[in-house]
């Protein structure tokens, strides 16, 4: 039975050209996290964090995506095209798969109120 819940950073807006941390946190389960996948709104994989093999950033995003902190992901040099939904998929044993969703809105610098770096526990 899947007892866990995914907490996310929540939906966020950030400045064009800035950076933002996307994070998910799995709680209320003792299941072992074997892999975390990060996907973009078009379902293309940004990065994978495997418990044994570590991080793999997909080539198309190598220049703008940094691993961490923790199991999170840092998106850098944001463009308007980065606006959209991002998915964290936690593969766990024995529970199975958990999924979190974060919507990122990238704004022109004159509109954006905040572009902070913060991580949830």
């Amino acid at each position: 039975m899947m007892t866990g819940t995914i907490e996310t950073t929540g939906n966020i807006s950030a400045k064009k050209g800035g950076s933002v941390i996307l994070q998910c946190h799995l709680s209320s389960t003792m299941a072992q996290v074997t892999q975390v996948n990060w996907e973009q709104h078009d379902h293309s994989l940004l990065a994978i964090r495997n418990a044994e093999l570590g991080w793999h950033i997909y080539p198309a995003f190598k220049d703008r995506v940094a691993p961490g902190p923790g199991l999170g992901l840092t998106l850098q040099s944001l463009t308007m095209n980065d606006t959209g939904e991002y998915f964290c998929t936690y593969h766990t044993y024995p529970d199975g798969t958990y999924r979190g969703r974060i919507f990122l809105e990238v704004l022109e610098s004159s509109v954006a109120e905040h572009s902070a770096r913060f991580q949830i526990p």
């Epitope: 929540g10 939906n11 966020i12 809105e105 704004l107």
Partner: antibody, heavy 119, light 112 residues
Amino acid sequence: EVQLQQSGPELVKPGASMKISCKASGYSFTDYIMNWVKQSHGKNLEWIGLSIPYNGGTSYNQKFEGKATLTVDKSSSTAYMELLSLTSEDSAVYYCARGIKGYFAMDYWGQGTSVTVSS
Amino acid sequence: DVVVTQTPLSLPVSFGDQVSISCRSSQSLVNSFGKTYLSWFLHKPGQSPQLIMYGVSNRFSGVPDRFSGSGSGTDFTLKISTIKPEDLGMYYCLQGTHQPWTFGGGTKLEIK
């Protein structure tokens, strides 16, 4: 003046599909997210999802995945919502509503499109 | 999904009254930047919903200052200081912090 003009009321048969349009004017269409909202029985409001005119992206309420398909036509500043395999549960008023930059809410709403599913 | 609960369901008023509508969410609406995406709408019969407040306490353009919004975390309030005829209708709160966005069930502001 910001305006969202939706297509007219529809009476459709169960099992059919239909498309609602929402033509935007008075602002730069690609600069703002477009949301879609369902109102059933004159009361409950439900967020269906949103379109991102700038890059064609979408985000859906999982409840409506497979039921609604959101698209945009940048050349005509029009957002569309196609409703698939309609049943009586889909009878409702549907609204398009522009997103407020940076606040995850809606500022301007279309006039609504009434959809009645009946044989 | 985040569950948003509004109270009361119905609020009978007299013109000139001050009223409060409550909106509670099943989890915190504060994102990792410390921002809270909670808005309020008024829906009058035969019209489209209209935005009243966004970001908890920002009045939308043209909304009179008798409307005020407050709250944090999971508990939020819309106050109307002096009820006028044009204030009657259904009030809804909306959380936009978590996917999917979710509305409260509504509060009907009506004459006693």
